[in-house]
């Protein structure tokens, strides 16, 4: 028969013929022969292969360090990766995560839109006319000038958008 | 700083048992095992066995199976190793140590001297 | 299970020689680890996953196999080196350590 040139999904070809892939956590010990099957072994501890493969090594853990402030989110099988993340308060440089940096905290005049997460970054927006933030944070939002007139007073200094507006008694007309 | 702290030497009689502890700090105890060894005086390193203290999880060697328990406090970060039915060949410096990629060091605790005595 | 067979059991090398210290399993396992220890400390990892040296472990250390044989070796001795060596297995339960090697300085 003519040898194949191509081969089914989890197989691959080698010498003219077809072998069997390793399943996911384990690697290639040695191709498969017209007499023999693909010998495999399982990856050790703190080793892993995510996929149907013929890899001779299996890939180590990642390492999710705490002096760069990352922790472990999800603890590595031999088929999966560890998946690191970062401590409270700050959030990853990367995609792959490899390291942290302190959230972003938003200025005085500037309040958080979004909530940083181990991932994102906080987003700041300048307060709008009628909102003040007068404090330095990753958490607050700008916060809406105080209505004088619904507790009676009148407004006895302009807020900004760092400050909030000064409330002050009304002036009583003298008969 | 990555340690592993265990607790101190053991003066035991044959058929007592004895619990040893081992405390983590620098690292979440859950997230990686935590192995047991053990070392006869002027004899070489023994595996006794391992805990996932995320989940319990634990595997001895057969020659310990039933006479050694490990447990995990993910609370105290700390990992015990309890064996039972002591006997004068158990006298041994006993070490708690990690997954080996922890900081690329594999930390070792200081080793706890165990006695077995009448 | 597996058993792990270190070989020399004890060996002395003069300062600058070459040193190979070898560990045959019953089967093929994924990787070994090798260990360091010296009288009265706790053991330490020196080599993992067969060939990667473990932090502050001197370049002039190295390791290598596959399968069933592996092997660590040390381009010139050194007296700081005098300590015994242990290779471990953590591919299949129980894992387990060879008997150790005594590397003694001439």
């Known amino acids: 028969p003519e040898p194949p040139t191509a081969c089914r999904e989890k197989q691959y070809l080698i010498n003219s013929q077809c072998c069997s892939l390793c399943q996911p956590g384990q690697k290639l010990v040695s191709d498969c022969t017209e007499f023999t099957e693909t010998e495999c072994l399982p990856c050790g501890e703190s080793e892993f292969l995510d996929t149907w493969n013929r890899e001779t090594h299996c890939h180590q853990h990642k390492y999710c360090d705490p002096n760069l402030g990352l922790r472990v989110q999800q603890k590595g099988t031999s088929e999966t990766d560890t998946i690191c993340t970062c401590e409270e308060g700050w959030h990853c440089t990367s995609e792959a995560c490899e390291s942290c940096v302190l959230h972003r905290s938003c200025s005085p005049g500037f309040g958080v839109k979004q909530i940083a997460t181990g991932v994102s970054d906080t987003i700041c927006e300048p307060c709008p006319v009628g909102f003040f933030s007068n404090v330095s944070s990753a958490f607050e939002k700008c916060h809406p000038w105080t209505s004088c007139e619904t507790k009676d007073l009148v407004v006895q200094q302009a807020g900004t958008n760092k400050t909030d507006v000064v409330c002050g008694p009304q002036d009583r007309l003298r008969a | 700083e990555v340690q592993l702290v265990q607790s101190g030497a053991e003066v035991k009689k044959p058929g007592a048992t004895v619990k040893i502890s081992c405390t983590v700090s620098?690292?979440?105890?859950?997230?990686?095992?935590i192995h047991w060894v053990k070392q006869r005086p002027g004899k070489g390193l023994e595996w006794m066995g391992r805990i996932d203290p995320e989940d319990g999880d634990t595997k001895y060697d057969p020659k310990f199976q039933g006479r050694v328990t490990m447990t995990a406090d993910t609370s105290t970060d700390t990992a015990y190793m309890e064996l039972s039915s002591l006997r004068s060949e158990d006298t041994a410096v006993y070490y708690c140590?990690?997954?080996?990629?922890?900081?690329?060091?594999?930390?070792w605790g200081q080793g706890t001297t165990v006695t077995v005595s009448s | 299970q597996i058993v792990l067979t270190q070989s020399p059991t004890i060996m002395s090398a003069s300062p600058g020689e070459k040193v190979i210290i070898t560990c045959s399993a019953t089967s093929s396992v994924s990787y070994i680890l090798w260990f360091q220890q010296k009288p009265g400390t706790s053991p330490k990892l020196w080599i993992y996953s067969t060939s990667n040296l473990a932090s502050g472990v001197p370049a002039r250390f190295s390791g290598s196999g596959s399968g069933a044989s592996y092997s660590l070796t040390i381009s010139r001795m050194e007296a700081e080196d005098a300590a015994t060596y242990y290779c471990?297995?953590?591919?299949?339960?129980?894992?387990?350590f060879g008997g150790g090697t005594k590397l003694e300085i001439k």
């Open positions: 620098g690292f979440n105890i859950k997230d990686y095992y």
């Open positions: 140590t990690t997954s080996y990629y922890v900081g690329t060091y594999g930390y």
């Open positions: 471990q297995q953590r591919t299949f339960y129980p894992y387990t």
